[in-house]
Interface confidence: low
């Protein structure tokens, strides 16, 4: 003899991303010559056996046999969420419930609050916001490959009462190394299935210049031509270069952009030379010790701020 349970239909809960397709499958062992039926959370019949009951082109029959009724709902909306009921009209009527959960996909995050041309050691504060997630998404920050610790993600219900807007802020002190860095806000959510959904903000940092003196050739000898290149870096790039020689009347004349030229080296050129690179952010002086008596000059790894 068949037990009563053999006439009890069974189904399963389903999770679907908004816009996706969900398949609802209901099975029964003993149908007792009765048809299976699917109805929606509003108790509207969707299919009774192979007969369509609701005019909604998104709902299609997948399979209808005496032991199974499977339907698909395409382009699922948040409003489709709820308990779907599979019924078999035996005596008594038996039902099985399928809870359909619809995930809201978070929108691409928006970064606000960036103030252009930050100065070194100033604090940058950026805000990130993403709407449309269900359940609420999480936001994370990074600077290049480095994780930034933003504040806790704030959650606000969207006007539709179903999805959420999440937001987070991050503050950090900028350094010269951050010039040109990308600050990335990423949204993490189960609907994305690991796919990256992020927005980046490139930041510019203004900082005092640095400079380095490079001799050309690297090992000049007496009688040779020597160029001392003053290579300035900074943001903005230094525009003014002034050369001095310790013990001499400043400044020395440049003959080629930022370079100091010695057409014909002699021993009297020996000494320590300073190149001051200046931008509107400040000045920096690099030094170089030239000893023409030796076969090669001895550079001094040197610098000063002003």
């Amino acid at each position: 003899n068949l037990s009563q349970d053999d006439s009890q239909p069974w189904t399963s809960d389903e999770t679907v991303v908004a816009g996706g397709t969900v398949v609802l499958k209901c099975q029964v062992k003993d149908h007792e010559d009765s048809s299976l039926q699917w109805s929606n959370p509003a108790q509207q019949t969707l299919y009774f056996g192979e007969k369509r009951a609701l005019r909604d082109n998104r709902i299609q029959l997948v399979s209808s046999t005496p032991h199974e009724l499977s339907i698909s709902i395409s382009n699922v909306a948040l409003a489709d969420e709820g308990e779907y009921t599979c019924s078999i009209f035996t005596m008594p009527v038996r039902t099985a419930k399928s809870l359909v959960t619809v995930l809201g996909i978070p929108q691409k995050p928006i970064i606000t609050g960036y103030k252009s041309s930050l100065r070194e050691k100033e604090t940058a504060t950026l805000n990130c916001q993403s709407s449309g997630s269900k359940p609420a998404a999480q936001l994370t920050w990074r600077k290049g490959d480095q994780e930034l610790h933003g504040d806790q993600t704030r959650i606000q219900e969207d006007p539709n009462g179903k999805t959420f807007t999440v937001s987070s802020s991050v503050s950090f002190q900028v350094t010269r190394e951050d010039d040109g860095a990308n600050i990335v806000c990423s949204v993490n959510h189960e609907s994305l299935k690991g796919a990256d959904r992020s927005t980046s903000q490139r930041i510019e940092v203004l900082y005092t210049p640095t400079a380095m003196i490079r001799p050309e050739p690297a090992h000049p000898r007496e009688g040779q031509k020597l160029l001392l290149h003053c290579e300035g870096r900074g943001n903005p790039v230094p525009q003014q270069y002034v050369w001095v020689k310790e013990g001499s009347e400043p400044p020395l004349k440049m003959t080629q952009e930022s370079a100091l030229i010695f057409p014909f080296l002699n021993k009297s050129d020996s000494g320590t030379y300073g190149c001051t690179a200046t931008s509107n952010m400040g000045s920096y002086t690099a030094y170089f010790t030239l000893n023409v008596n030796d076969p090669s000059p001895v550079p001094s790894s040197s610098s000063t701020y002003h």
């Epitope: 005092t208 030094y287 001094s300 790894s301 040197s302 610098s303 000063t304 701020y305």
Partner: nanobody, 124 residues
């Protein structure tokens, strides 16, 4: 002439912290860069950290990055090295140093004046 007098060394357990100080006298301290070096038994003296005259620029050896902090108080003519998360391999004699001109250098050859050295022992 510059005199550099160090203090603050001693014995500390792994994971512990120490703060080294280096007081300068003689010439105006604030005009010049300062550096810390160390020499472990049987090894060469190695660069640890340096700071420029204004305190605006610092440089650290890879072994010190993230654990050590160099700073200076020009009003007190004093240089500091805060050492956190100390390891056994940090055991060494630590020296503060100053160059004869306003030129920060990450090479011991760039320094003309040296402190007397202070022993830091990291051991459980």
């Amino acid at each position: 002439q510059v005199q550099l007098v160090q203090s603050g060394g001693g014995l500390v357990q792994p994971g512990g912290s120490l703060r080294l100080s280096c007081a300068a006298s003689g010439r105006t301290f604030s005009n010049y860069a300062r550096g810390w070096f160390r020499q472990a038994p049987g090894k060469e003296r190695e660069f640890v950290a340096a700071i420029d005259y204004s305190g605006g620029s610092t440089n650290y050896a890879d072994s010190a990055k993230g654990r050590f902090t160099i700073s200076r108080d020009n009003s007190k003519n004093t240089l500091y090295l805060q050492m956190n998360s100390l390891r056994a391999e940090d055991t060494a004699v630590y020296y503060c140093a100053a160059p004869a001109s306003r030129r920060p250098s990450w090479d011991a050859d760039g320094y003309d004046y040296w402190g007397q050295g202070t022993l830091v022992t990291v051991s459980s």
